[in-house]
């Protein structure tokens, strides 16, 4: 009886179960009754990352410097090239096909997580007791100055964008 289903890492063709090509190799010719599947390695600029019956290997991704991209990990015959973004930029999508500059956190917001090549800056509002008076991709919210530790008093209350203003204590009798 000709098979209707094949084992793992096989495929059915012309009533025969043929071996799939291993990762890093492409199909040249299907197996026959007397011969095994013929596979050939992908060339240096190509890859296939699964057991397959592909007749063409996939081209490695090109990390285009004009789009701010650079190689994070060189591709092999079994893996694609992984691109990342140059300093100060991050990927616009999971597939990292282009880059944009990191976002800066506006005054009143601080950096919760510094951007990487693949993720943007994460900002958070400065909570009570903290402020940020700059637009920055690196600066966290800073705590208000503690006037008491300087033997001073608060002359002007702080906000999420401004520090407190300290002044001398009134020397009243």
């Amino acid at each position: 009886e000709p098979p209707t289903a094949c084992r793992e890492k096989q495929y059915l063709i012309n009533s025969q179960c043929c071996s799939l090509c291993q990762p890093g190799q492409k199909l040249v010719s299907d197996c026959t009754e007397f011969t095994e599947t013929e596979c050939l390695p992908c060339s240096e600029s190509e890859f296939l990352d699964t057991w397959n019956r592909e007749t063409r290997c996939h081209q490695h991704k090109y990390c285009d410097p004009n789009l701010g991209l650079q190689v994070q990990q060189k591709g092999t015959s079994e893996t694609d090239t992984i691109c990342t973004c140059e300093e100060g930029l991050h990927c616009t999508s999971e597939s990292c096909e282009s880059c944009v500059p990191h976002r800066s956190c506006l005054p009143g917001f601080g950096v919760k997580q510094i951007a990487t090549g693949v993720s943007d800056t994460i900002c958070e509002p400065c909570p009570v007791g903290f402020f940020s008076n700059v637009s920055s991709a690196f600066e966290k919210c800073r705590p208000w100055t503690s006037c008491e530790t300087k033997d001073l008093v608060v002359q002007q209350a702080g906000t999420n964008k401004t520090d407190v203003v300290c002044g001398p204590q009134d020397r009243q009798r």
Epitope: E1, C31, T32, F34, T35, E36, E38
Partner: antibody, heavy 123, light 107 residues
Framework: EVQLVESGGGLVQPGGSLRLSCAAS????????MSWVRQAPGKGLEWVGF??????????EYAASVKGRFTISRDNSKNTLYLQMNSLRAEDTAVYYC??????????????WGQGTLVTVSS | DIQMTQSPSSLSASVGDRVTITCRAS??????LNWYQQKPGKAPKLLIY???RRDSGVPSRFSGSGSGTDYTLTISSLQPEDFATYFC?????????FGGGTKVEIK
């Protein structure tokens, strides 16, 4: 011991018929493809045809030079392979070998041979 | 059909000699190449299958190599019992075809 023994060879006139037999022993006959190979006197080897195993419905394949004239069959209950030769020609004169065809897709080969039986086609 | 061309058709050698027989296919046979030994009045005997795999019981002095269309049978040190005719056979595509044979004779 794995063994193949041919019989049935002899002298036959052009246009005549002959049936060769090959008795197999020492292995599970129905599991194997079985083949006939011939060798004209002082010449090289020529594949004649084969019959597939039970799993492949005992279907047959033939060389172009004998297709339509020769028929390969088998009787698995008797562990015997046959070659029915009709419309014989002078060029069919040869020693006929029965051979077991073995292996996997990483190389098939004739791994067991009989001693051969001579067929002479002459008037 | 795939044509198999063996060379030389015959050779003379002495015991202990290294002997090389070549077989050329008319197209790529992807290593599906077998070698047989035949002595006068006897049936052929399988020596090597799939280019380089020795059949059980075949002495290690017999070795096979090659790829694509060109294949070689080597006898590293010829023994008296090795004087015989050697045939190659392709097993890639029907009809199976044999080389014309190489007769190894005593010098």
């Amino acid at each position: 011991e794995v063994q193949l023994v041919e019989s049935g060879g002899g002298l036959v006139q052009p246009g005549g018929s002959l049936r060769l037999s090959c008795a197999a022993s020492g292995f599970t006959f129905s599991d194997y493809y079985m083949s006939w190979v011939r060798q004209a006197p002082g010449k090289g080897l020529e594949w004649v045809g084969f019959i597939r195993n039970k799993a492949n419905a005992y279907t047959t394949e033939y060389a172009a030079s004998v297709k339509g004239r020769f028929t390969i069959s088998r009787d698995n209950s008797k562990n015997t392979l046959y070659l029915q030769m009709n419309s014989l020609r002078a060029e069919d004169t040869a020693v006929y070998y029965c051979a077991r065809y073995g292996g996997l897709r990483q190389g098939w080969y004739f791994d067991v041979w009989g001693q051969g039986t001579l067929v002479t086609v002459s008037s | 059909d795939i044509q198999m061309t063996q060379s030389p058709s015959s050779l003379s050698a002495s015991v202990g000699d290294r002997v090389t027989i070549t077989c050329r296919a008319s197209q790529d046979i992807r290593n599906y190449l077998n070698w047989y030994q035949q002595k006068p009045g006897k049936a052929p005997k399988l020596l090597i299958y799939y280019t380089s795999r020795r059949d059980s019981g075949v002495p290690s002095r017999f070795s096979g190599s090659g790829s694509g269309t060109d294949y070689t049978l080597t006898i590293s040190s010829l023994q008296p019992e090795d004087f015989a005719t050697y045939f190659c056979q392709q097993g890639k595509t029907l009809p199976w075809t044999f080389g014309g044979g190489t007769k190894v004779e005593i010098k």
